[in-house]
């Protein structure tokens, strides 16, 4: 009985710029099929726990799975399946119709370079002063890899680091993206965003650290040197990040053109998706390449600005030049002006 | 159509700079933002660093932050970057773009032909 968690089980994540994240298509014994979301009973809606494809991350050597669900932007290869009985079986699979099938999407984390450790050291009174100085990024529960509170450990002690939003510390930022191979320093976060806030009923593993840290040297190029331990503080920021490897990204795709090369731009965001509206801040082909690249097109060839004549157009809005640095999504409810792209044919 | 022709290619060893240059064939007034990107073999075309006008606000890959430094010079029509501490796996064809604005919000996006970089070890 052919299922996702068989050691002979084969599968790939399709239509998108990372094998990590995609569409889910599976090897038969005939030859590569797109899943379609409706399988094993689901509806083309519904969205799943994704830990229960967490064999099928760890096939692809990624990470952890961070959603399981429609992939709502279907690219129909030669054969698309539906499958029967249980999540993840693949004994009793028909050919579907490829307009009544939406395909089921994966995103794992991308792999990191090295692993760091993934859980905190528990509290104890034993100095270790052989295990070297390490940095934690603790994030929301559901929340995101490369985002959220910094804790930094030393020995036996670890805690968060006090933070005043006057400290100048950009380069210790990138330092720290970069030691925890998240790449370089986008933003700070509030720390609802990142996190602190506590929920009571949390484990006690999760609690607020005994120790604290503060900045000692912004300059720092070996972590040791970085903080120095402070008496905890019962208010005042901590330290919360947003790295430029920050999972899961923005997902796009291109909507109404004669191809799959070119139309108007949707983003994704949970499990709508809606048109991206321009922003004149952001109005370059940097923006574009990278959709471009994801629908694996060749390069941008132009974009046009279309007129939101109607005040009531809504869509999603990001600040930044790259979508891939957007971390959030803001939503424009008026007067939203779509962009119609067309990138270069990989194919002509 | 606004023609691009990259310059400054070559072979340097690994610690070296290069400066590359990008001229554009007619006025930079339509240019809205300029771009370097490359490409090494078996790989994706990726950003290296890219500017806007008449703000100047630029963005850098991860990769290329604190080594790299791209600039435009609108007189002469031109894109500069000035690459520094040059690494073996900075080998690739270095392409440059630009947005052209032909108004009403219609853009059109020229590239040049690439100009290759070796960075020996």
């Known amino acids: 009985r052919l299922s996702w968690y068989d050691p002979d089980f084969q599968a790939r994540l399709t239509r998108s710029n990372s094998k990590c994240q995609g569409q889910l298509e599976v090897y038969l014994k005939d030859g590569w099929h797109m899943v379609c979301s409706q399988s094993w009973g689901r509806s083309s809606k519904q969205w799943e726990d994704p830990s229960q494809a967490s064999k099928v991350c760890q096939r692809l050597n990624c990470g952890v799975p961070l959603s399981l669900g429609p992939f709502l932007v279907t690219y129909t290869p030669q054969s698309s399946i539906i499958c029967y009985g249980q999540l993840g079986s693949f004994s009793n699979c028909s050919h579907s119709r490829n307009d009544m099938c939406h395909s089921l999407g994966l995103t794992c984390l991308e792999p990191q370079k090295t692993t760091p450790p993934t859980t905190r050291p528990p509290p104890t009174t034993t100095p270790e002063p052989t295990a070297p100085p390490r940095l934690q990024l603790v994030a929301q529960s559901g929340g995101q890899h490369c985002a959220g509170v910094v804790e930094f450990y030393s020995g036996s002690l670890g805690g968060t680091i006090s933070y005043e939003a006057q400290d100048k510390t950009q380069d210790l930022e990138n330092f720290l993206c970069n030691n925890l191979q998240c790449g370089s320093f986008l933003k700070h976060l509030p720390e609802t965003e990142a996190g602190r806030a506590q929920d009571p009923g949390e484990p006690r593993e999760h609690q607020p650290l005994p120790i604290q840290w503060k900045i000692q040297n912004s300059s720092c190029t070996s972590l040791e040197h970085c903080f120095r331990k402070i008496k905890p503080q019962k208010s005042g920021r901590v330290l919360a990040l947003l790295c430029s490897g920050f999972q899961p990204k923005v997902q796009s795709r291109l909507v109404g053109g004669s191809s799959i090369c070119e139309g108007t731009v949707e983003v994704r965001q949970g499990a709508q998706w809606a048109a991206l509206c321009d922003s004149s801040s952001a109005r370059s082909s940097l923006r574009w390449e990278e959709v471009c690249r994801e629908q694996q097109c060749g390069s941008v060839n132009s974009y046009r600005v279309l007129d939101a004549g109607d005040p009531t157009s809504r869509g999603l809005f990001c600040p930044h030049q790259k979508l891939s640095q957007c971390h959030e999504l803001w939503e424009r409810n008026s007067y939203c002006k779509k962009v119609f792209v067309t990138c270069q044919d990989p194919n002509p | 159509e606004v023609q691009l022709v990259e310059s400054g290619g070559g072979l340097v060893q690994a610690g070296g700079s290069l400066r590359l240059s990008c001229a554009a064939s007619?006025?930079?007034?339509?240019?809205?933002?300029m771009g370097w990107y490359r490409q090494a073999p078996g790989k994706q075309r990726e950003l290296v660093a890219a500017?806007?006008?008449?703000?100047?606000?630029?963005n850098y890959a991860d990769s290329v932050k604190g080594r790299f430094t791209i600039s435009r010079d609108n007189a002469k029509n031109t894109m500069l970057l000035q690459m520094n501490s040059l690494k073996p796996e900075d080998t690739a064809v270095y392409y440059c773009?630009?947005?052209?604005?032909?108004?009403?919000?219609?853009?059109?996006?020229?590239w040049g032909q690439g100009t290759q970089v070796t960075v020996s070890s």
């Open positions: 007619e006025s930079t007034f339509s240019i809205t933002a």
């Open positions: 500017i806007t006008s008449p703000g100047g606000s630029t």
């Open positions: 773009n630009a947005d052209i604005n032909h108004g009403s919000g219609y853009y059109t996006v020229s």
